[in-house]
């Protein structure tokens, strides 16, 4: 028989983690495996049909994507949809596929809303999701004794699809669910100094443990301004929510692993400011299969898609599409073996959820509502050389924090700063005022 | 030949102005006219196919509506779509129909965004739209000498589809385009007293000419609180943006034409407070055809749809669907006469735009970008008996304000209050400080 996979991803723009130039080769590699393995869909042909989730400007679109999905459904009646990745594109498509009772598989769509499976029925996320970041941060808070207050800042940048809004939304909601904690969240515009200065006025009153989702340059600017305002000492800790590790990568901007460095006149100050900074990223898979997969992926991307794939965490997304597709095909194979059909979306989906799977990204666990458990890394500066390195990993499946041996978190005080200052944010603790008065007697 | 009209409107919930129980009878009456008139589509049959824009709870939905549109397109390949009316339902449908190059005709979708015809190509709005309210308000400001500052308040009520947000958005953007004026806008929650108190603190610093979109009860509450705070004297004017005249209707709530009256202990104060209030509504058509149409509409609604239609401005919406559909059929007839086809959406649409038409709602003008010119009424209190009555009408086609003979706007000072107080909002006018100092010498 024939199994049709309808792809709705950016076909022209290569800059998204889920661009077809990146995911296409991963799909090819997965389908090559299906062909090579007699236990997967024996006697079946799997073919892909493509629709674009971009508008004419190459930007993800909440109109183009569902229109593409409708056209594909109409013409090809696919068994499964692959993508979209962008939140605004995935939302209408996911609601359509739910209505059609056709499975949707993606390694994007990380926003909180997609976890609501009455609205997004049969949507499986084989990639990371922002609520899972909340699981990590909650575990971190428990470990470090921060159970009362946090502050989350997120940048608004025109044309970035509100990435940081959705990231902080997922993080905020899940942390609040997991811990009985006060969390404030504030938005700022990266290209307006007044937004930074207002944040700096607010910080002393609102938090000492601060999460920031922004571009690497904006994070550095904020750290420099915080240093200038005297907010970068031992009392504060700033977590950069840099999930794809952009600031650690080198290239045009920061030096590799030295996210404070730009080769400009502010490097000395920036290095000092970054002593109060830590960086949160997805975890890079460290299994040998992943490295082998990346070699093949890059080769295929260049050969068949004329695309040169850079290194970095962004490649975990095509790898997750690869693993997700294999998991889906495994589920279809089992459904057929039990007398079902490829159009039995509910049955197939149920076989994917609450299941573990060994993929190129390592051990992969899809939870009971169809979302992948996600691993994260926490990076900290080595005070000796200013380079950042992973000091702690979070295993999403076991929900455990695992220290990297021989490395520990670096705290200027020798211990984590309290999440609420000793005397309260506005010196409101009566005991402190009492002390203060007694010294005047 | 056959011409298929695909309807995407609320089929179950009768509370929307564009519910099928209201619009259906209007469509029936229009199609009866087509049958009866030999000059309209001779030899053609017009049929309607129905899709619902509501979700399972009977609420307009940005998922249900485009899904319905897709299903109708698929199964019936219609020549035109009628509806949706709700903003969130109409947005994806309008983008889909633009992509399909199929005309969309509605008397809803009043939000500013639908005026952008590169995105909503072939969308014709035969009903009122919020940007046109801005044309009226700009004309009013010119007439009354308010060319510097205004304040717009809009209520957020869960589940009301952000009606007031969209209304104030259209008003705000168009007034700013038409006049070189500073306009501030603030949102408030109708069910939170702290929001009202914050508004009352803000008003003295932000405006004297104040537009308020809210429920009648919330407007009355705000007026009572303003009176209590001393903000209701001759210095302020409060315009209730009550476009369907809900507060003037009687029934369960206010007495007819006495929007301040509730038969409670606050009526005396409310009447006093409402001396600073004016009400803006759509204009009730006063042509004899409209009254005759309403009689038939109500009869048909009861007979065929088992729905009892109340009186009120809300009936201008089904009437506008009626007129719009006849205008569309006129345009199709002309297109066919010129050798075109019913699928020639561009040509048909061009024949509807920039065109006048005598309908049951009176003289109807569609502007050059496919939006109907809209008439408004301004209501003011008769100080003698406390009843509100129309004192001024706005003709959207001629863009003129037309006073109702024998009636004039009622101003406590005898003239409109200035939009900026004599000494500025914060007494910042140096001349005033000078005066003030001189009295101390």
């Amino acid at each position: 028989g024939n199994l049709t996979v309808a792809v709705v991803l950016p076909l022209a723009n290569t800059s998204y983690p889920w661009s077809w130039a990146r995911v296409g080769p991963a799909v090819e590699l997965a389908l090559a495996q299906v062909k090579a393995r007699p236990d997967l869909l024996p006697g079946w042909t799997v073919r892909t049909v493509l629709g674009s989730s971009e508008n004419a400007l190459g930007v993800c679109s909440d109109t183009a994507a569902p229109l593409a999905a409708v056209d594909l459904k109409w013409e090809h009646n696919p068994a499964v949809f692959l993508g979209p990745g962008c939140v605004y594109a995935a939302a209408p498509v996911g609601r359509f596929t739910a209505h059609w009772r056709v499975p949707l598989l993606t390694a994007g769509a990380p926003a909180l809303g997609f976890g609501v499976k009455d609205e997004y029925a049969l949507t499986t996320r084989a990639g990371p999701s922002y609520a899972k970041l909340g699981d990590f941060v909650a575990a971190l808070h428990r470990r470090l004794g921060w159970e009362r207050q946090a502050l989350m800042l997120y940048a608004y940048r025109p044309g970035d699809e509100e990435h940081c809004f959705f990231l902080v939304e997922g993080l905020f909601m899940r942390v609040r669910d997991r811990l009985n904690i006060t969390v404030d969240h504030l938005e700022f515009a990266e290209d307006d100094l007044s937004h930074y200065t207002r944040l700096l006025r607010t910080m002393p009153r609102k938090g000492r443990v601060i999460y920031i989702c922004s571009s690497p340059d904006a994070f550095r600017t904020l750290m420099l301004l915080a240093l200038e305002a005297g907010l970068c000492g031992e009392d504060y800790v700033f977590f950069h929510l840099d999930i794809f590790g952009q600031s650690l990568q080198g290239g045009q901007g920061p030096a590799p692993r030295r996210p404070w460095e730009r080769g400009d006149g502010q490097d000395v100050s920036a290095r000092q400011a970054f002593q109060a900074a830590k960086i949160i990223t997805y975890k890079d898979p460290d299994n040998p299969e992943y490295l082998e997969f990346l070699k093949q992926l890059k080769h295929l991307a260049y050969e068949q898609f004329n695309f040169t794939m850079e290194d970095g965490l962004v490649n975990t997304i095509p790898a997750s599409f690869h693993d997700g597709l294999l998991l889906y095909i495994q589920a279809v194979t089992e459904t057929l073996a039990h007398g079902g059909t490829v159009t039995d979306g509910e049955n197939i989906t149920q076989r994917m959820w609450n299941r573990s799977f060994q993929g190129v990204t390592g051990y992969l666990k899809i939870d009971s509502s169809g979302d992948r458990e996600t691993d994260f890394s926490l990076w900290d500066m080595d005070p000796e050389n200013g380079a950042f390195r992973v000091v702690l990993n979070y295993n999403g499946t076991s929900q455990e924090l695992v220290a990297v041996s021989g490395r520990k978190l670096n705290w200027p005080l020798g211990y984590p700063p309290p999440d609420i200052p000793k005397c309260g944010f506005d010196n409101e603790d009566p005991a402190c005022n009492q002390d203060h008065l007694s010294t005047l007697e | 030949g056959n011409l298929t009209v695909a309807v995407v409107l609320p089929l179950a919930n009768t509370s929307y102005p564009w519910s099928w129980a209201r619009v259906g009878p209007a469509v029936e009456l229009a199609l009866a006219q087509v049958k009866a008139r030999p000059d309209l589509l001779p030899g053609w049959t017009v049929r309607t196919v129905l899709g619902s824009s509501e979700n399972a709870l009977g609420v307009c939905s940005d998922t249900a509506a485009p899904l319905a549109a897709v299903d109708l397109k698929w199964e019936h390949n219609p020549a035109v779509f009628l509806g949706p009316g709700c903003v969130y339902a109409a947005a994806p449908v309008g983008r889909f129909t633009a992509h399909w190059r199929v005309p969309l005709l509605t008397a809803g979708a009043p939000a500013l965004g639908f005026g952008v015809k590169d995105e909503y190509a072939l969308t014709t709005r035969a009903g009122p739209s919020y940007a046109k309210l801005g044309d009226f308000v700009a004309a009013l400001h010119r007439r009354l000498g308010w060319e510097r500052q205004a304040l717009m308040l809009y209520a957020y009520r869960p589940g009301d589809e952000e009606h007031c947000f969209f209304l104030v958005e259209g008003l705000f953007m168009r007034v700013r385009d038409r006049l070189n004026i500073t306009v501030d806008h603030l949102e408030f929650a109708e069910d939170d007293l702290s929001h009202y108190t914050r508004l009352l603190r803000t008003m003295p610093r932000k405006g004297r000419v104040i537009y308020i979109c809210s429920s009648p009860d919330a407007f009355r509450t705000l007026m009572l609180l303003a009176l209590e705070a001393g903000l209701c004297g001759e210095d302020y004017v409060f315009f209730h943006l009550d476009i369907f005249g809900q507060s003037l209707q009687g029934g369960q709530g206010p007495a007819p034409r006495r929007p301040w009256e509730r038969g409670d202990g606050q009526d005396v104060s409310a009447r006093q407070a409402f001396q600073a209030a004016k009400i803006i509504t759509y204009k009730d058509p006063d042509n004899p055809e409209y009254l005759e149409f309403l009689k038939q509409l109500k009869h048909l609604a009861y007979e065929q749809f088992n729905f009892t239609m109340e009186d009120g401005l809300v009936n201008t919406i089904p009437a506008s669907f009626h007129d719009g559909l006849l205008l569309y059929i006129q345009a199709v007839t002309e297109t066919l006469a010129h050798g075109g086809t019913v699928t020639d959406g561009e040509n048909i649409t061009q024949r509807m735009w920039n065109r006048s038409f005598q309908g049951v709602t009176g003289y109807l003008k569609i502007d050059s970008s496919g939006d109907r010119e809209t008439d408004f009424s301004l209501w003011d209190m008769d100080p003698e008996n406390g009843a509100f009555r129309v004192v001024l009408n706005y003709n959207g086609t001629s863009q003129e304000l037309v006073a109702v003979s024998g009636r004039k706007l009622n101003w406590p000072l005898g003239y409109p209050p200035p939009d900026i107080p004599k000494c500025g909002f914060d007494n910042e006018d140096p001349a005033c400080n000078q005066d003030h100092l001189s009295t101390l010498e």
């Epitope: 290209d191 307006d192 100094l193 007044s194 200065t197 200038e228 305002a229 005297g230 400009d264 | -």
Partner: antibody, heavy 119, light 107 residues
């Protein structure tokens, strides 16, 4: 709308003093840094002084260090430049500029006030 | 202090031409570079910040590029209103410094 209006310029003798003022509207000066930039007629632009958003950092160009003082009055939304020991070579048009250090740089400029130092 | 060197100091071009002005910093300034346009008797107007970002309201015929020490301003199709003096400026480190200017004249 952002506006910066300088005043206080004029003719002064060498060794004399002037106090330039800059009234800002459309934004709060305490949310931004502010700078003074001067331009000798027919010549290029020279930055001479800056103050950061919270007033905690003040910077001067070497060419005028010790002779100028920058200050700000947040309540009046105004910036000032006190200039002492003026020299003929200080004759220039002095612009008040909103300063977004590390973000957008010098984004809004006043039209300038002319200072003429002449005996 | 960081020196900014602009070239050329003057440039003649015709309406419709594409022109490029370069600016070099004496030490690395990453992308903290702005470009200004000044017309006689007027205050400078900010065109570009962060080396390549357009200030709001500036037409897209202006573009900037570069990072570190070498930067360029390009005007894709000259119009009569574009003939003016252009300055680059670094805002990485105080004291801020400007290039000496490039006067763009009609040929």
């Amino acid at each position: 709308e952002v506006q910066l209006v300088e005043s206080g310029g004029g003719v002064v003798r060498p060794g004399g003093s002037l106090r330039l003022s800059c009234a800002a509207s459309g934004f709060n000066v305490d949310d931004y840094g502010m700078s003074w930039v001067r331009q000798i007629p027919g010549k290029g632009l020279e930055w001479i002084s800056g103050i950061n958003w919270n007033g905690g950092r003040i910077y001067y160009a070497d060419s005028m260090k010790g002779r100028i003082t920058i200050s700000r009055d947040n309540a009046k939304n105004s910036l000032y430049l006190q200039m002492n020991s003026l020299r003929a070579e200080d004759t220039a048009l002095y612009h008040c500029v909103r300063d977004q250090w590390l973000v957008r740089g010098l984004d809004y400029w006043g039209q300038g006030t002319l200072v003429t130092v002449s005996s | 202090d960081i020196q900014m060197t602009q070239s050329p100091s003057s440039l003649s071009a015709s309406v419709g031409d594409r022109v490029t002005i370069t600016c070099r910093a004496s030490q690395g300034i990453y992308n903290y570079l702005a470009w200004f346009q000044q017309k006689p008797g007027k205050a400078p107007k900010s065109l570009i910040y962060a080396a390549s970002s357009l200030q709001s309201g500036v037409p897209s015929k202006f573009s900037g590029s570069g990072s570190g020490t070498d930067f360029t301003l390009t005007i894709s199709s000259l119009q009569p209103e574009d003939f003016a003096t252009y300055y680059c400026q670094q805002y990485n480190t105080y004291p801020y410094t400007f290039g000496q200017g490039t006067k763009l004249e009609i040929k």
